[in-house]
């Protein structure tokens, strides 16, 4: 079952997700999506990184931590009740079926 995180309407929500880069700056692609993780990738992507930088994001979603050190925790700005639900953080470690995926439940009150 998903780990649950809470936030209040109008505040920022924080959904933690971390990995350890093999070497400093040796990043792996990460996607965040609204909805549980599908078989591959993310559904309804809100943000993604590649091996170098954040290369896709939608308004109100950002990475507040140092993603170059593996902190890919998602911040959602000024949340509303519609932001409630499951979010997927998928860390796409290269190789054969190496992905790490995390489903996080956001509850807005």
């Amino acid at each position: 079952s998903e780990v649950e995180y809470r936030a209040e309407v109008g505040q920022n929500a924080y959904l933690p997700c971390f990995y350890t880069p093999a070497a400093p700056g040796n990043l792996v692609p990460v996607c965040w999506g609204k909805g549980a993780c599908p078989v591959f990738e993310c559904g309804n992507v809100v943000l993604r990184t590649d091996e170098r930088d954040v290369n896709y994001w939608t308004s109100r979603y950002w990475l507040n931590g140092d993603f170059r050190k593996g902190d890919v925790s998602l911040t959602i700005e000024n949340v509303t009740l519609a932001d409630s639900g499951i979010y997927c953080c998928r860390i796409q470690i290269p190789g054969i079926m190496n992905d790490e995926k995390f489903n996080l439940k956001l509850v807005i009150k």
């Epitope: 909805g35 078989v39 591959f40 990738e41 896709y56 190789g95 992905d99």
Partner: antibody, heavy 121, light 107 residues
Framework: QVQLQESGGGLVKPGGSLKLSCAAS????????MSWVRQTPDKRLEWVAT????????YYLDSVKDRFTISRDNAKNTLYLQMSSLKSEDTAMYYC??????????????WGQGTMVTVSS | DIVMTQSPSFLSASVGDRVTITCKAS??????VAWYQQRPGKAPKPLIY???TRHTGVPSRFSGSGSGTEFTLTISSLQPEDFATYFC?????????FGGGTKLELK
């Protein structure tokens, strides 16, 4: 328009090898995940393997993971499936398919016409 | 592996009929279900993804619904070109799996 053209199928003996190719055109090949799906003689569809846009992440059906290798050459706009230690149960029509992923993962939105692989002694 | 049980396996209908095909997943798959149409001798063609979203160019007479474990594909008014085999697929967890197919035949 999007086109996917498989080749390389044929008749092979059990234990043999075969390499399938899928030539892609009409879209930016390096911006899509790609998959192989097969259809058995009884018309059942079975996912075989998927590769990420860069080739860095790879996924296999358990029954083929030690025998098949999916790969891609983005410079040549071509997807491959190297098959070895073939068994009679690998007999099928093999399709390559495109998987959009960037803003929303969607499985197999375009398919090729397929190439037939027959494993028989 | 998640088993997708499709019913019926065969369906006879007439032009203009409304038909519904059902797919049941052996485990929860959220809305990660797609539907495909396959005409004889042709490759599968995508119709629906995310349980209810039509692919570009798919006629509005095709609709999908459901979430969790039960899903349906409805064709509101059958056209001659709709007589084909239909497959559902789940893409919630690995391996991606397909239903056994529903062959829609002209009555």
């Amino acid at each position: 328009q999007v086109q996917l053209q498989e080749s390389g199928g044929g008749l092979v003996k059990p234990g043999g090898s075969l390499k399938l190719s899928c030539a892609a055109s009409g879209f930016t090949f390096s911006s899509y995940y790609m998959s192989w799906v097969r259809q058995t003689p009884d018309k059942r569809l079975e996912w075989v393997a998927t590769i990420s846009n860069s080739g860095g992440s790879i996924y296999y059906l358990d029954s083929v993971k030690d025998r098949f290798t999916i790969s891609r050459d983005n410079a040549k706009n071509t997807l491959y499936l190297q098959m070895s230690s073939l068994k009679s149960e690998d007999t099928a029509m093999y399709y390559c398919a495109r998987d959009p992923y960037y803003s929303n993962y969607v499985p197999m939105d375009y398919w090729g016409q397929g190439t037939m692989v027959t494993v028989s002694s | 592996d998640i088993v997708m049980t499709q019913s019926p396996s065969f369906l006879s209908a007439s032009v203009g009929d409304r038909v519904t095909i059902t797919c049941k997943a052996s485990q929860y798959v959220d809305t990660y279900v797609a539907w495909y149409q396959q005409r004889p001798g042709k490759a599968p063609k995508p119709l629906i993804y995310s349980a209810s979203t039509r692919h570009t160019g798919v006629p509005s007479r095709f609709s999908g619904s459901g979430s969790g474990t039960e899903f349906t594909l409805t064709i509101s008014s059958l056209q001659p070109e709709d007589f084909a085999t239909y497959f559902c697929a789940q893409y919630s967890s690995s391996p991606l799996t397909f239903g056994g197919g529903t062959k829609l035949e002209l009555k």
